[in-house]
Amino acid sequence: GDLLIQKTIKKQVVLEEGTIAFKNWVKTGTEVYRQFWIFDVQNPQEVMMNSSNIQVKQRGPYTYRVRFLAKENVTQDAEDNTVSFLQPNGAIFEPSLSVGTEADNFTVLNLAVAAASHIYQNQFVQMILNSLINKSKSSMFQVRTLRELLWGYRDPFLSLVPYPVTTTVGLFYPYNNTADGVYKVFNGKDNISKVAIIDTYKGKRNLSYWESHCDMINGTDAASFPPFVEKSQVLQFFSSDICRSIYAVFESDVNLKGIPVYRFVLPSKAFASPVENPDNYCFCTEKIISKNCTSYGVLDISKCKEGRPVYISLPHFLYASPDVSEPIDGLNPNEEEHRTYLDIEPITGFTLQFAKRLQVNLLVKPSEKIQVLKNLKRNYIVPILWLNETGTIGDEKANMFRSQVTGKIN
Protein backbone atom coordinates (compact mmCIF):
# COMPACT_ATOMS: atom_id res chain seq x y z
CA GLY A 1 0.00 0.00 0.00
CA ASP A 2 2.67 2.50 1.05
CA LEU A 3 4.66 1.74 -2.04
CA LEU A 4 1.68 2.42 -4.26
CA ILE A 5 1.03 5.73 -2.48
CA GLN A 6 4.68 6.68 -2.88
CA LYS A 7 4.50 5.86 -6.55
CA THR A 8 1.34 7.95 -6.97
CA ILE A 9 2.83 10.87 -5.05
CA LYS A 10 6.02 10.74 -7.10
CA LYS A 11 3.94 10.84 -10.24
CA GLN A 12 1.65 13.67 -9.08
CA VAL A 13 4.33 16.07 -7.79
CA VAL A 14 6.22 16.16 -11.07
CA LEU A 15 6.00 19.61 -12.67
CA GLU A 16 4.50 18.70 -15.99
CA GLU A 17 1.15 19.07 -17.71
CA GLY A 18 -1.53 16.83 -16.19
CA THR A 19 -0.29 16.53 -12.61
CA ILE A 20 -1.95 18.00 -9.50
CA ALA A 21 1.30 19.76 -8.65
CA PHE A 22 1.61 21.42 -12.06
CA LYS A 23 -1.92 22.83 -12.03
CA ASN A 24 -1.40 24.49 -8.65
CA TRP A 25 2.14 25.47 -9.48
CA VAL A 26 1.29 27.42 -12.65
CA LYS A 27 -1.36 29.45 -10.83
CA THR A 28 -1.62 29.15 -7.09
CA GLY A 29 -5.07 28.18 -5.90
CA THR A 30 -4.35 29.85 -2.58
CA GLU A 31 -5.23 33.48 -2.00
CA VAL A 32 -2.06 35.30 -1.07
CA TYR A 33 -2.14 38.62 0.76
CA ARG A 34 0.63 41.04 1.51
CA GLN A 35 0.00 43.25 4.52
CA PHE A 36 2.10 46.36 5.05
CA TRP A 37 2.76 48.28 8.24
CA ILE A 38 4.41 51.67 7.65
CA PHE A 39 6.69 53.21 10.26
CA ASP A 40 5.41 56.77 10.62
CA VAL A 41 8.19 59.01 12.00
CA GLN A 42 6.89 61.14 14.87
CA ASN A 43 9.86 63.50 15.40
CA PRO A 44 11.48 64.33 12.03
CA GLN A 45 12.77 67.77 13.08
CA GLU A 46 14.41 66.56 16.29
CA VAL A 47 16.20 63.80 14.41
CA MET A 48 17.45 66.13 11.69
CA MET A 49 18.50 68.94 14.02
CA ASN A 50 19.71 67.05 17.11
CA SER A 51 20.39 63.51 15.91
CA SER A 52 17.75 62.27 18.37
CA ASN A 53 16.46 58.72 18.43
CA ILE A 54 13.88 58.20 15.69
CA GLN A 55 10.42 57.73 17.18
CA VAL A 56 8.28 55.51 14.99
CA LYS A 57 4.69 54.41 15.18
CA GLN A 58 3.59 51.56 12.97
CA ARG A 59 0.39 52.06 10.97
CA GLY A 60 -1.35 49.19 9.27
CA PRO A 61 -2.24 46.74 8.01
CA TYR A 62 -2.63 47.99 4.45
CA THR A 63 -3.43 44.84 2.52
CA TYR A 64 -2.87 43.86 -1.11
CA ARG A 65 -3.78 40.70 -2.94
CA VAL A 66 -0.63 39.35 -4.62
CA ARG A 67 0.56 36.31 -6.56
CA PHE A 68 -2.77 35.96 -8.36
CA LEU A 69 -1.19 35.87 -11.82
CA ALA A 70 -0.26 32.63 -13.53
CA LYS A 71 3.36 31.91 -14.31
CA GLU A 72 4.35 33.05 -17.79
CA ASN A 73 6.56 31.65 -20.56
CA VAL A 74 6.39 28.17 -19.00
CA THR A 75 8.81 26.09 -21.06
CA GLN A 76 9.76 22.47 -20.49
CA ASP A 77 13.24 21.30 -21.38
CA ALA A 78 13.13 17.54 -21.88
CA GLU A 79 16.90 17.33 -22.21
CA ASP A 80 17.79 18.48 -18.71
CA ASN A 81 14.39 17.84 -17.10
CA THR A 82 13.75 21.42 -16.17
CA VAL A 83 10.92 23.89 -16.58
CA SER A 84 11.54 27.60 -16.92
CA PHE A 85 9.11 30.44 -16.19
CA LEU A 86 8.57 34.04 -15.21
CA GLN A 87 6.63 34.93 -12.07
CA PRO A 88 4.60 38.06 -12.92
CA ASN A 89 4.08 40.68 -10.22
CA GLY A 90 0.75 42.23 -9.45
CA ALA A 91 -0.85 43.85 -6.43
CA ILE A 92 -4.48 44.81 -5.86
CA PHE A 93 -5.39 46.95 -2.87
CA GLU A 94 -7.97 45.41 -0.52
CA PRO A 95 -9.74 48.27 1.30
CA SER A 96 -11.85 45.93 3.44
CA LEU A 97 -8.69 44.33 4.87
CA SER A 98 -6.94 47.66 5.45
CA VAL A 99 -7.02 50.34 8.15
CA GLY A 100 -7.10 53.16 5.61
CA THR A 101 -6.67 54.01 1.95
CA GLU A 102 -3.72 54.20 -0.42
CA ALA A 103 -3.98 57.98 -0.08
CA ASP A 104 -3.03 57.92 3.62
CA ASN A 105 0.01 60.09 4.40
CA PHE A 106 3.15 59.02 6.22
CA THR A 107 6.28 60.80 7.39
CA VAL A 108 9.18 58.65 6.23
CA LEU A 109 12.85 58.97 5.44
CA ASN A 110 13.53 60.75 2.15
CA LEU A 111 14.55 57.73 0.07
CA ALA A 112 16.30 59.74 -2.66
CA VAL A 113 18.30 61.90 -0.25
CA ALA A 114 19.46 58.89 1.79
CA ALA A 115 20.33 56.84 -1.29
CA ALA A 116 22.08 59.59 -3.27
CA SER A 117 24.22 60.64 -0.32
CA HIS A 118 25.28 57.00 0.13
CA ILE A 119 25.96 56.27 -3.53
CA TYR A 120 27.91 59.50 -4.14
CA GLN A 121 30.34 59.89 -1.26
CA ASN A 122 32.72 62.19 -3.11
CA GLN A 123 32.65 65.65 -1.46
CA PHE A 124 32.41 67.59 -4.70
CA VAL A 125 29.46 65.49 -5.87
CA GLN A 126 27.82 65.76 -2.44
CA MET A 127 27.99 69.54 -2.72
CA ILE A 128 26.19 69.38 -6.05
CA LEU A 129 23.59 67.10 -4.48
CA ASN A 130 23.23 69.51 -1.57
CA SER A 131 22.46 72.43 -3.85
CA LEU A 132 19.82 70.35 -5.68
CA ILE A 133 18.31 69.10 -2.42
CA ASN A 134 18.02 72.69 -1.21
CA LYS A 135 16.69 73.93 -4.55
CA SER A 136 13.97 71.26 -4.55
CA LYS A 137 13.09 72.05 -0.91
CA SER A 138 13.74 68.41 -0.01
CA SER A 139 14.72 67.35 3.48
CA MET A 140 15.86 64.31 5.47
CA PHE A 141 12.25 63.24 5.90
CA GLN A 142 9.26 63.56 3.57
CA VAL A 143 5.52 63.10 3.64
CA ARG A 144 4.28 60.53 1.12
CA THR A 145 1.08 58.62 0.49
CA LEU A 146 1.06 54.84 0.83
CA ARG A 147 0.67 54.52 -2.95
CA GLU A 148 3.66 56.75 -3.59
CA LEU A 149 5.86 55.07 -1.02
CA LEU A 150 5.21 51.55 -2.28
CA TRP A 151 4.69 51.94 -5.99
CA GLY A 152 6.60 55.09 -6.90
CA TYR A 153 6.57 58.88 -7.18
CA ARG A 154 8.54 61.46 -9.13
CA ASP A 155 11.16 62.79 -6.75
CA PRO A 156 11.62 66.60 -6.88
CA PHE A 157 15.31 66.46 -6.00
CA LEU A 158 16.19 63.76 -8.53
CA SER A 159 14.19 65.64 -11.15
CA LEU A 160 16.74 68.46 -10.92
CA VAL A 161 19.77 66.22 -11.44
CA PRO A 162 21.20 67.23 -14.83
CA TYR A 163 22.34 63.68 -15.63
CA PRO A 164 20.42 60.63 -16.77
CA VAL A 165 19.04 59.21 -13.52
CA THR A 166 15.77 57.46 -12.72
CA THR A 167 13.63 60.18 -11.20
CA THR A 168 10.87 57.82 -10.01
CA VAL A 169 11.39 56.38 -6.56
CA GLY A 170 9.38 53.78 -4.63
CA LEU A 171 10.20 50.86 -2.36
CA PHE A 172 8.68 48.39 -4.82
CA TYR A 173 8.98 50.46 -7.99
CA PRO A 174 8.57 49.10 -10.62
CA TYR A 175 6.14 46.33 -9.59
CA ASN A 176 2.89 45.97 -11.55
CA ASN A 177 3.55 44.73 -15.09
CA THR A 178 6.95 43.36 -14.15
CA ALA A 179 8.03 39.77 -13.55
CA ASP A 180 10.55 37.95 -11.38
CA GLY A 181 12.88 35.53 -13.10
CA VAL A 182 13.55 33.77 -15.43
CA TYR A 183 13.57 30.80 -13.04
CA LYS A 184 14.63 27.41 -14.31
CA VAL A 185 13.66 24.61 -11.92
CA PHE A 186 13.93 20.84 -12.02
CA ASN A 187 10.62 19.25 -12.98
CA GLY A 188 11.38 16.00 -11.11
CA LYS A 189 10.81 13.70 -14.06
CA ASP A 190 14.14 11.95 -13.78
CA ASN A 191 14.70 12.48 -10.04
CA ILE A 192 11.78 13.37 -7.78
CA SER A 193 14.12 14.44 -4.98
CA LYS A 194 15.09 17.43 -7.14
CA VAL A 195 11.57 18.60 -8.01
CA ALA A 196 11.08 22.40 -7.77
CA ILE A 197 14.73 22.94 -6.88
CA ILE A 198 16.08 25.94 -8.74
CA ASP A 199 18.69 25.16 -11.36
CA THR A 200 19.26 28.75 -12.53
CA TYR A 201 17.89 32.21 -11.79
CA LYS A 202 18.17 34.85 -14.50
CA GLY A 203 20.33 32.38 -16.40
CA LYS A 204 22.90 31.93 -13.62
CA ARG A 205 23.61 29.51 -10.79
CA ASN A 206 25.00 32.31 -8.65
CA LEU A 207 23.73 35.75 -7.72
CA SER A 208 26.93 37.85 -8.00
CA TYR A 209 25.92 39.78 -4.87
CA TRP A 210 27.88 37.84 -2.26
CA GLU A 211 31.18 36.06 -1.80
CA SER A 212 31.64 32.29 -1.54
CA HIS A 213 28.70 30.01 -0.59
CA CYS A 214 26.49 32.98 0.31
CA ASP A 215 26.14 33.68 -3.40
CA MET A 216 24.60 30.31 -4.20
CA ILE A 217 21.00 29.82 -5.31
CA ASN A 218 19.88 26.99 -3.07
CA GLY A 219 16.72 24.94 -2.88
CA THR A 220 13.27 25.87 -4.16
CA ASP A 221 11.26 29.11 -4.10
CA ALA A 222 9.54 27.84 -0.88
CA ALA A 223 6.17 27.26 -2.57
CA SER A 224 6.94 23.55 -2.49
CA PHE A 225 9.76 21.15 -1.67
CA PRO A 226 10.64 17.67 -2.87
CA PRO A 227 8.21 15.10 -1.38
CA PHE A 228 8.62 13.01 1.76
CA VAL A 229 9.92 15.80 3.94
CA GLU A 230 11.63 14.69 7.16
CA LYS A 231 11.60 16.66 10.40
CA SER A 232 15.37 16.46 10.54
CA GLN A 233 15.77 18.22 7.20
CA VAL A 234 17.04 21.75 6.75
CA LEU A 235 14.88 23.20 4.00
CA GLN A 236 16.80 25.54 1.73
CA PHE A 237 15.03 28.10 -0.41
CA PHE A 238 15.81 31.20 -2.43
CA SER A 239 13.98 34.50 -1.95
CA SER A 240 14.52 37.18 -4.58
CA ASP A 241 12.98 39.73 -2.17
CA ILE A 242 15.99 39.43 0.10
CA CYS A 243 18.50 38.66 -2.67
CA ARG A 244 19.74 35.48 -1.01
CA SER A 245 19.10 31.86 -0.22
CA ILE A 246 18.06 31.04 3.33
CA TYR A 247 16.83 28.00 5.25
CA ALA A 248 14.11 26.80 7.60
CA VAL A 249 14.19 24.16 10.34
CA PHE A 250 11.43 22.03 11.85
CA GLU A 251 9.66 23.56 14.83
CA SER A 252 6.41 21.69 15.49
CA ASP A 253 3.59 19.51 14.22
CA VAL A 254 0.52 21.54 13.27
CA ASN A 255 -2.96 20.49 12.24
CA LEU A 256 -4.09 22.63 9.35
CA LYS A 257 -7.76 22.12 8.46
CA GLY A 258 -7.44 18.46 9.34
CA ILE A 259 -4.18 18.02 7.45
CA PRO A 260 -1.07 17.17 9.49
CA VAL A 261 1.69 19.58 8.49
CA TYR A 262 5.21 20.33 9.67
CA ARG A 263 5.87 23.89 10.74
CA PHE A 264 9.32 24.99 9.58
CA VAL A 265 10.66 28.33 10.80
CA LEU A 266 13.57 30.59 9.94
CA PRO A 267 15.83 30.25 12.99
CA SER A 268 17.56 33.18 14.69
CA LYS A 269 20.85 31.48 13.72
CA ALA A 270 20.15 32.39 10.09
CA PHE A 271 20.36 36.08 11.07
CA ALA A 272 23.30 35.73 13.45
CA SER A 273 26.64 37.47 13.08
CA PRO A 274 29.65 35.46 11.87
CA VAL A 275 30.86 35.51 15.47
CA GLU A 276 27.96 33.25 16.43
CA ASN A 277 27.40 31.56 13.05
CA PRO A 278 30.64 31.43 11.03
CA ASP A 279 28.70 30.39 7.91
CA ASN A 280 27.34 33.94 7.75
CA TYR A 281 30.75 35.57 7.24
CA CYS A 282 30.03 36.19 3.58
CA PHE A 283 26.82 38.08 4.31
CA CYS A 284 28.90 40.70 6.09
CA THR A 285 29.94 42.98 3.25
CA GLU A 286 31.43 45.97 5.08
CA LYS A 287 33.08 46.63 8.42
CA ILE A 288 31.80 50.03 9.61
CA ILE A 289 28.02 49.72 9.81
CA SER A 290 28.34 46.09 10.90
CA LYS A 291 30.79 47.09 13.65
CA ASN A 292 33.41 44.73 12.29
CA CYS A 293 30.80 42.05 11.52
CA THR A 294 29.59 41.85 15.12
CA SER A 295 26.14 43.37 14.44
CA TYR A 296 23.44 40.93 13.47
CA GLY A 297 19.86 40.73 12.26
CA VAL A 298 20.22 43.12 9.32
CA LEU A 299 21.30 42.26 5.79
CA ASP A 300 22.92 44.83 3.54
CA ILE A 301 21.43 44.18 0.08
CA SER A 302 22.76 47.37 -1.53
CA LYS A 303 24.65 45.36 -4.16
CA CYS A 304 21.32 43.93 -5.27
CA LYS A 305 19.66 47.36 -5.29
CA GLU A 306 21.98 49.36 -7.59
CA GLY A 307 23.98 50.62 -4.63
CA ARG A 308 20.98 52.02 -2.72
CA PRO A 309 21.60 51.38 0.99
CA VAL A 310 18.73 48.95 1.57
CA TYR A 311 18.92 46.72 4.63
CA ILE A 312 16.56 43.79 5.15
CA SER A 313 15.64 42.56 8.59
CA LEU A 314 12.82 40.82 10.38
CA PRO A 315 9.98 43.10 11.52
CA HIS A 316 10.75 45.36 14.49
CA PHE A 317 14.37 44.15 14.26
CA LEU A 318 13.46 40.73 15.66
CA TYR A 319 16.67 38.69 16.19
CA ALA A 320 18.79 41.84 15.61
CA SER A 321 21.59 43.14 17.81
CA PRO A 322 20.80 45.92 20.31
CA ASP A 323 23.02 48.44 18.49
CA VAL A 324 20.74 48.21 15.42
CA SER A 325 17.50 49.06 17.23
CA GLU A 326 19.06 51.39 19.83
CA PRO A 327 18.56 54.61 17.77
CA ILE A 328 14.90 53.71 17.04
CA ASP A 329 12.10 54.13 19.60
CA GLY A 330 8.71 52.44 19.27
CA LEU A 331 9.70 48.94 18.18
CA ASN A 332 8.29 45.83 19.90
CA PRO A 333 9.63 42.63 18.35
CA ASN A 334 7.92 39.35 19.14
CA GLU A 335 8.38 35.95 17.54
CA GLU A 336 4.73 35.09 17.11
CA GLU A 337 3.98 38.15 14.98
CA HIS A 338 7.30 38.79 13.33
CA ARG A 339 8.99 35.53 12.41
CA THR A 340 8.64 33.66 9.13
CA TYR A 341 7.20 30.15 8.98
CA LEU A 342 6.21 27.56 6.37
CA ASP A 343 3.61 24.85 7.02
CA ILE A 344 4.57 21.94 4.81
CA GLU A 345 2.56 18.84 4.09
CA PRO A 346 5.38 16.29 4.38
CA ILE A 347 4.19 13.67 1.93
CA THR A 348 3.84 15.97 -1.07
CA GLY A 349 6.27 18.67 0.09
CA PHE A 350 3.65 21.34 -0.68
CA THR A 351 3.60 24.50 1.41
CA LEU A 352 -0.04 24.71 2.46
CA GLN A 353 0.29 27.76 4.68
CA PHE A 354 3.00 30.33 5.14
CA ALA A 355 3.77 33.70 6.66
CA LYS A 356 6.73 35.48 5.14
CA ARG A 357 7.69 38.51 7.21
CA LEU A 358 10.37 41.03 6.47
CA GLN A 359 11.22 44.65 7.09
CA VAL A 360 12.67 47.15 4.64
CA ASN A 361 15.15 49.61 6.12
CA LEU A 362 17.34 52.32 4.65
CA LEU A 363 20.70 53.44 5.92
CA VAL A 364 21.21 57.17 6.40
CA LYS A 365 24.58 58.58 7.35
CA PRO A 366 25.85 61.99 8.43
CA SER A 367 27.23 64.08 5.60
CA GLU A 368 29.43 67.13 6.06
CA LYS A 369 28.34 68.58 2.75
CA ILE A 370 24.62 67.78 2.70
CA GLN A 371 22.90 70.33 4.88
CA VAL A 372 19.90 68.19 5.85
CA LEU A 373 22.23 65.40 7.05
CA LYS A 374 24.90 67.66 8.56
CA ASN A 375 23.68 67.55 12.16
CA LEU A 376 23.51 63.77 12.35
CA LYS A 377 26.01 62.36 14.83
CA ARG A 378 25.52 58.68 13.97
CA ASN A 379 24.39 56.24 11.34
CA TYR A 380 20.77 55.11 11.38
CA ILE A 381 19.29 51.99 9.83
CA VAL A 382 15.82 53.48 9.45
CA PRO A 383 12.80 51.15 9.33
CA ILE A 384 10.45 52.17 6.52
CA LEU A 385 7.92 49.36 6.59
CA TRP A 386 7.42 45.73 7.38
CA LEU A 387 5.31 43.23 5.51
CA ASN A 388 3.53 40.00 6.17
CA GLU A 389 2.83 37.87 3.11
CA THR A 390 0.46 35.05 3.93
CA GLY A 391 -1.31 32.25 2.17
CA THR A 392 -3.46 29.39 3.47
CA ILE A 393 -4.94 26.49 1.56
CA GLY A 394 -8.65 27.07 0.93
CA ASP A 395 -11.32 24.88 2.53
CA GLU A 396 -12.23 23.21 -0.76
CA LYS A 397 -8.61 22.44 -1.62
CA ALA A 398 -8.05 21.20 1.94
CA ASN A 399 -10.96 18.76 1.59
CA MET A 400 -9.57 17.52 -1.70
CA PHE A 401 -6.14 17.17 -0.13
CA ARG A 402 -7.52 15.23 2.85
CA SER A 403 -9.46 12.82 0.69
CA GLN A 404 -6.82 12.26 -1.97
CA VAL A 405 -3.57 12.39 0.02
CA THR A 406 -3.63 12.29 3.81
CA GLY A 407 -6.88 10.31 4.00
CA LYS A 408 -5.48 7.56 1.82
CA ILE A 409 -2.36 7.23 3.94
CA ASN A 410 -4.16 7.27 7.27
Epitope: N122, Q123, F124, V125, M127, I128, N130, S131, Y163, E368, K369, Q371, K374
Partner: antibody
Protein backbone atom coordinates in the same frame (compact mmCIF):
# COMPACT_ATOMS: atom_id res chain seq x y z
CA UNK B 1 55.54 67.18 -7.78
CA UNK B 2 52.15 67.91 -9.40
CA UNK B 3 52.51 69.79 -12.66
CA UNK B 4 49.58 71.28 -14.52
CA UNK B 5 50.22 73.12 -17.78
CA UNK B 6 47.48 75.22 -19.38
CA UNK B 7 47.41 76.24 -23.02
CA UNK B 8 45.01 77.63 -25.61
CA UNK B 9 44.61 81.17 -24.31
CA UNK B 10 44.88 84.23 -26.55
CA UNK B 11 43.14 87.32 -27.86
CA UNK B 12 39.70 86.83 -29.39
CA UNK B 13 36.79 89.01 -30.41
CA UNK B 14 33.43 89.03 -28.59
CA UNK B 15 31.21 86.15 -29.72
CA UNK B 16 34.14 83.93 -30.69
CA UNK B 17 35.14 80.60 -29.18
CA UNK B 18 38.27 79.22 -27.58
CA UNK B 19 39.30 75.87 -26.21
CA UNK B 20 41.66 75.69 -23.25
CA UNK B 21 43.65 72.60 -22.33
CA UNK B 22 45.41 71.58 -19.16
CA UNK B 23 47.89 68.75 -19.24
CA UNK B 24 48.88 66.88 -16.11
CA UNK B 25 52.05 64.95 -15.41
CA UNK B 26 50.31 62.81 -12.82
CA UNK B 27 49.82 59.10 -13.26
CA UNK B 28 46.86 59.41 -10.87
CA UNK B 29 45.13 62.14 -12.91
CA UNK B 30 42.06 59.90 -13.53
CA UNK B 31 41.32 59.68 -9.81
CA UNK B 32 41.12 63.42 -9.10
CA UNK B 33 38.31 65.94 -9.49
CA UNK B 34 39.38 69.03 -11.45
CA UNK B 35 38.28 72.65 -11.87
CA UNK B 36 38.84 75.77 -13.92
CA UNK B 37 39.21 78.97 -11.89
CA UNK B 38 39.78 82.45 -13.33
CA UNK B 39 41.29 85.66 -11.98
CA UNK B 40 39.74 88.80 -13.41
CA UNK B 41 41.60 92.06 -14.07
CA UNK B 42 39.93 93.35 -10.86
CA UNK B 43 41.84 90.60 -8.96
CA UNK B 44 38.68 88.57 -8.26
CA UNK B 45 38.93 84.75 -8.20
CA UNK B 46 35.91 82.89 -9.62
CA UNK B 47 35.11 79.21 -10.06
CA UNK B 48 34.28 78.63 -13.73
CA UNK B 49 33.55 74.90 -13.87
CA UNK B 50 34.33 71.63 -12.11
CA UNK B 51 34.31 67.97 -13.14
CA UNK B 52 34.51 64.75 -11.19
CA UNK B 53 37.24 62.14 -11.65
CA UNK B 54 35.54 60.01 -14.32
CA UNK B 55 34.03 62.98 -16.14
CA UNK B 56 30.44 61.90 -15.52
CA UNK B 57 29.48 64.82 -13.29
CA UNK B 58 30.09 68.47 -14.04
CA UNK B 59 29.26 71.68 -12.23
CA UNK B 60 28.89 75.26 -13.47
CA UNK B 61 27.94 78.21 -11.25
CA UNK B 62 24.71 79.83 -12.44
CA UNK B 63 26.65 83.00 -13.27
CA UNK B 64 28.52 81.15 -16.01
CA UNK B 65 25.38 81.05 -18.20
CA UNK B 66 26.26 77.63 -19.68
CA UNK B 67 28.50 79.11 -22.36
CA UNK B 68 31.41 76.98 -21.16
CA UNK B 69 31.82 73.21 -21.24
CA UNK B 70 34.31 71.37 -19.05
CA UNK B 71 35.50 67.92 -20.11
CA UNK B 72 38.43 65.61 -19.64
CA UNK B 73 40.31 62.84 -21.39
CA UNK B 74 41.79 60.62 -18.71
CA UNK B 75 43.79 58.61 -21.23
CA UNK B 76 45.59 61.83 -22.24
CA UNK B 77 45.63 63.16 -18.67
CA UNK B 78 44.12 66.38 -20.01
CA UNK B 79 41.38 68.73 -18.83
CA UNK B 80 39.52 70.98 -21.30
CA UNK B 81 37.38 74.09 -21.21
CA UNK B 82 35.38 74.86 -24.35
CA UNK B 83 34.39 78.53 -24.23
CA UNK B 84 31.85 79.93 -26.66
CA UNK B 85 30.04 83.26 -27.19
CA UNK B 86 32.86 84.97 -25.36
CA UNK B 87 32.26 88.39 -23.80
CA UNK B 88 34.64 91.10 -22.63
CA UNK B 89 33.77 90.10 -19.01
CA UNK B 90 35.42 86.73 -19.69
CA UNK B 91 38.83 88.42 -19.94
CA UNK B 92 40.90 86.77 -17.21
CA UNK B 93 43.77 84.49 -16.37
CA UNK B 94 42.38 80.95 -16.48
CA UNK B 95 43.86 78.36 -14.15
CA UNK B 96 43.23 74.66 -13.98
CA UNK B 97 43.24 73.29 -10.46
CA UNK B 98 43.18 69.80 -9.11
CA UNK B 99 41.29 68.85 -5.99
CA UNK B 100 42.97 67.12 -3.05
CA UNK B 101 42.55 63.50 -2.04
CA UNK B 102 40.16 64.31 0.80
CA UNK B 103 37.93 66.55 -1.27
CA UNK B 104 39.88 69.77 -0.79
CA UNK B 105 39.11 72.18 -3.60
CA UNK B 106 41.98 73.69 -5.64
CA UNK B 107 44.84 71.96 -3.83
CA UNK B 108 47.22 72.38 -6.82
CA UNK B 109 47.19 75.00 -9.58
CA UNK B 110 48.67 75.38 -13.03
CA UNK B 111 50.52 78.56 -14.09
CA UNK B 112 47.47 79.81 -15.99
CA UNK B 113 46.69 80.91 -19.54
CA UNK B 114 45.52 84.42 -20.36
CA UNK B 115 42.29 84.95 -22.30
CA UNK B 116 41.60 88.44 -23.63
CA UNK B 117 38.24 89.20 -25.22
CA UNK B 118 38.42 92.49 -27.03
CA UNK B 119 36.92 94.13 -30.10
CA UNK C 1 24.52 81.78 -2.07
CA UNK C 2 27.07 82.40 0.67
CA UNK C 3 28.79 85.76 0.31
CA UNK C 4 32.27 86.20 1.76
CA UNK C 5 33.41 89.60 2.99
CA UNK C 6 37.18 89.86 3.30
CA UNK C 7 38.99 92.67 5.09
CA UNK C 8 41.13 94.66 4.82
CA UNK C 9 41.49 95.06 1.03
CA UNK C 10 45.15 96.01 1.49
CA UNK C 11 47.65 95.91 4.29
CA UNK C 12 51.12 97.36 4.73
CA UNK C 13 53.17 95.65 7.41
CA UNK C 14 56.78 95.61 8.59
CA UNK C 15 58.91 92.48 8.79
CA UNK C 16 58.36 90.65 12.06
CA UNK C 17 54.90 92.10 12.59
CA UNK C 18 51.74 90.03 13.08
CA UNK C 19 49.35 90.06 10.12
CA UNK C 20 45.62 89.46 10.58
CA UNK C 21 43.09 89.03 7.76
CA UNK C 22 39.41 88.44 8.40
CA UNK C 23 36.64 86.80 6.41
CA UNK C 24 32.99 86.90 7.37
CA UNK C 25 30.41 84.67 5.67
CA UNK C 26 26.71 85.37 5.23
CA UNK C 27 25.76 81.81 6.28
CA UNK C 28 27.10 79.32 8.81
CA UNK C 29 29.77 77.28 7.02
CA UNK C 30 31.08 75.28 10.02
CA UNK C 31 34.87 75.28 9.55
CA UNK C 32 34.84 74.94 5.76
CA UNK C 33 37.17 77.88 5.08
CA UNK C 34 40.36 77.74 2.99
CA UNK C 35 43.16 80.31 2.63
CA UNK C 36 45.29 80.92 -0.47
CA UNK C 37 48.39 82.94 -1.16
CA UNK C 38 49.19 84.33 -4.60
CA UNK C 39 52.56 85.90 -5.24
CA UNK C 40 53.07 88.16 -8.30
CA UNK C 41 53.37 86.15 -11.51
CA UNK C 42 52.50 82.88 -9.76
CA UNK C 43 49.31 80.81 -9.40
CA UNK C 44 47.49 80.74 -6.08
CA UNK C 45 48.82 78.31 -3.46
CA UNK C 46 46.69 76.59 -0.84
CA UNK C 47 48.05 77.33 2.64
CA UNK C 48 45.22 76.25 4.92
CA UNK C 49 42.31 73.95 4.10
CA UNK C 50 39.00 73.13 5.79
CA UNK C 51 39.12 72.62 9.52
CA UNK C 52 41.96 75.17 9.93
CA UNK C 53 44.36 72.52 8.63
CA UNK C 54 47.85 73.72 7.68
CA UNK C 55 48.90 72.11 4.40
CA UNK C 56 52.09 70.01 4.30
CA UNK C 57 55.21 72.12 3.71
CA UNK C 58 53.54 75.39 4.75
CA UNK C 59 55.53 77.25 7.46
CA UNK C 60 54.00 77.22 10.94
CA UNK C 61 53.92 81.03 11.12
CA UNK C 62 50.72 80.75 9.07
CA UNK C 63 47.58 79.79 10.98
CA UNK C 64 43.83 80.29 10.96
CA UNK C 65 40.92 80.05 13.33
CA UNK C 66 37.18 80.42 13.25
CA UNK C 67 33.95 78.48 12.96
CA UNK C 68 30.50 79.35 11.72
CA UNK C 69 30.66 82.79 10.11
CA UNK C 70 33.79 84.49 11.46
CA UNK C 71 37.28 83.48 10.31
CA UNK C 72 40.75 84.88 10.90
CA UNK C 73 44.00 84.19 9.05
CA UNK C 74 47.24 85.06 10.83
CA UNK C 75 50.91 85.39 9.89
CA UNK C 76 52.77 85.41 13.19
CA UNK C 77 56.05 87.07 12.11
CA UNK C 78 55.87 88.54 8.64
CA UNK C 79 58.78 87.89 6.27
CA UNK C 80 59.51 89.71 3.02
CA UNK C 81 58.62 86.54 1.07
CA UNK C 82 55.06 86.80 2.41
CA UNK C 83 54.30 89.79 0.18
CA UNK C 84 51.34 88.51 -1.88
CA UNK C 85 47.60 88.57 -2.39
CA UNK C 86 45.66 86.45 0.13
CA UNK C 87 42.22 84.98 -0.52
CA UNK C 88 39.74 83.08 1.58
CA UNK C 89 37.40 80.52 0.01
CA UNK C 90 34.30 79.00 1.54
CA UNK C 91 33.88 75.37 0.49
CA UNK C 92 30.79 74.55 2.51
CA UNK C 93 28.27 74.96 -0.30
CA UNK C 94 27.89 75.74 -3.97
CA UNK C 95 28.58 78.09 -5.58
CA UNK C 96 31.99 78.27 -3.94
CA UNK C 97 32.80 81.88 -3.15
CA UNK C 98 36.12 83.63 -2.68
CA UNK C 99 36.77 86.70 -0.64
CA UNK C 100 37.77 89.80 -2.67
CA UNK C 101 41.39 89.41 -1.57
CA UNK C 102 43.86 91.25 0.64
CA UNK C 103 47.00 92.79 -0.86
CA UNK C 104 49.82 92.45 1.65
CA UNK C 105 52.75 94.82 1.14
CA UNK C 106 55.95 95.62 2.99
CA UNK C 107 55.96 98.83 4.98
Amino acid sequence: EVQLVESGGGVVQPGESLKLSCESNEYEFPSHDMSWVRKTPERRLELVAAINSDGAITYYPDTMERRFIISRDNTKKTLYLQMSSLKSEDTAMYYCARHGQTGTWFAYWGQGTLVTVSA
Amino acid sequence: ETTVTQSPASLSMAIGEKVTIRCITSTDIDDDMNWYQQKPGEPPKLLISEGNTLRPGVPSRFSSSGYGTDFVFTIENMLSEDVADYYCLQSDNLPLTFGAGTKLELK
